[in-house]
């Protein structure tokens, strides 16, 4: 292991479409990949009227978006399918959504709403 970095060897596995895909429904997935590459865990889910439905969880291949992330956090604003990735064994057991507010510079004078 590289100092200060948690290597990912296994992740929580889940597949909502397990019957169609002929896989297990839940379990632990050992992560394989080229030995020169980093490995991560991921989680995908949907928010159906406030109810969280997990789509898939498992291993994710070398991705700089996941480097040094110990927590699985989706930061994209209102995606159709939520996705997060992280480093460290079973780090995808818990996942969360914290949208990153994009700070955009106004290109012209900001419009002040008229009082009612």
């Amino acid at each position: 292991a590289i100092l200060g970095r948690s290597e990912t060897q296994e992740c929580i596995f889940y597949n909502a479409n397990w019957e169609r895909d002929r896989t297990n429904r839940t379990g632990v997935e050992p992560c394989y990949g080229d030995k020169d590459k980093r490995r991560h865990c991921f989680a995908t889910w949907k928010n159906i009227s406030g109810s969280i439905e997990i789509v898939k969880q498992g291993c994710w291949l070398d991705d700089i978006n996941c480097y040094d992330r110990t927590d699985c956090i989706e930061k994209k604003d209102s995606p159709e399918v939520y996705f997060c990735c992280c480093e460290g064994n079973m780090c995808n057991e818990r996942f969360s959504y914290f949208p990153e507010m994009e700070v955009t510079q106004p290109t012209s004078n900001p419009v002040t709403p008229k009082p009612p």
């Epitope: 394989y32 080229d34 590459k37 991921f42 995908t44 789509v55 898939k56 498992g58 291993c59 994710w60 291949l61 070398d62 991705d63 700089i64 978006n65 994209k76 995606p79 159709e80 399918v81 939520y82 996705f83």
Partner: antibody, heavy 115, light 111 residues
Framework: QVQLVQSGAEVKKPGSSVKVSCKAS????????INWVRQAPGQGLEWMGT????????SYAQKFQGRVTITADTSTSTAYMELSSLRSEDTAVYYC????????WGQGTLVTVSS | QSALTQPRSVSGSPGQSVTISCTGT?????????VNWYQQHPGKAPKPMIY???RRPSGVPDRFSGSKSGNTASLTISGLQAEDEADYYC???????????FGGGTKLTVL
């Protein structure tokens, strides 16, 4: 071993669309991205876009925005790239590649646009 | 999303070393270790030679090395061999919040 096998060569008329497929094997398809890259005859590589194979989330190069659609069918481990409103300048070899690092490539699909 | 800049061509004799540069901006090459190098022989698909600035995929000879200084990444090939004659492209990681971009390519001639 990891393999990406692409569909065969296509000849298309200007204004029409083409859909190229890329079937992945030798790894878990839903564990990475699939990128699409094209190369016109005698020219360099040009990135077109990417898809997260598990979430379906896509990003496209500005140049192709509105004209390219990348999709993934997880049940067959196949990614697709559809390019519409074809013109002669779209004549190129189209490649799919695995992951953000483009570590494995398909064999390429020649798309010829000619009237 | 503008292309990275590479020299059109470089050349060297067998046994010599050559370096190919790839210049971008502080928001692409300069911002993170996410530059890749690919080798392409005529009529073939590109082959990854270096990724993440300096990481070498297994199977790639250690004659190939990558580095970065500021907004410029470099590929150095030492002990040139005839089979190294090819086109070389730099490119960035693409996926998630990162958009891909390639250099224009450099033709390496082994004299």
């Amino acid at each position: 071993q990891v393999q990406l096998v692409q569909s065969g060569a296509e000849v298309k008329k200007p204004g029409s669309s083409v859909k190229v497929s890329c079937k992945a094997s030798g790894y878990t398809f839903t564990s990475s991205y699939i990128n699409w890259v094209r190369q016109a005859p005698g020219q360099g590589l040009e990135w077109m876009g990417t898809i997260n194979a598990v979430s379906g989330s896509t990003s496209y190069a500005q140049k192709f925005q509105g004209r390219v659609t990348i999709t993934a069918d997880t049940s067959t481990s196949t990614a697709y790239m559809e390019l519409s409103s074809l013109r002669s300048e779209d004549t190129a070899v189209y490649y799919c590649a695995r992951g953000g690092w483009f570590d494995y490539w398909g064999q390429g699909t020649l798309v010829t646009v000619s009237s | 999303q503008s292309a990275l800049t590479q020299p059109r061509s470089v050349s060297g004799s067998p046994g010599q070393s050559v370096t190919i540069s790839c210049t971008g901006t502080s928001s692409d090459v300069g911002s993170a270790n996410y530059v890749n190098w690919y080798q392409q022989h005529p009529g073939k698909a590109p082959k990854p030679m270096i990724y993440g600035v300096s990481r070498r995929p297994s199977g790639v000879p250690d004659r190939f090395s990558g580095s970065k200084s500021g907004n410029t990444a470099s590929l150095t090939i030492s002990g040139l061999q005839a089979e190294d004659e090819a086109d070389y492209y730099c490119g960035t990681f693409a996926g998630g919040k990162y958009y891909g971009v390639f250099g224009g390519g450099t033709k390496l001639t082994v004299l």
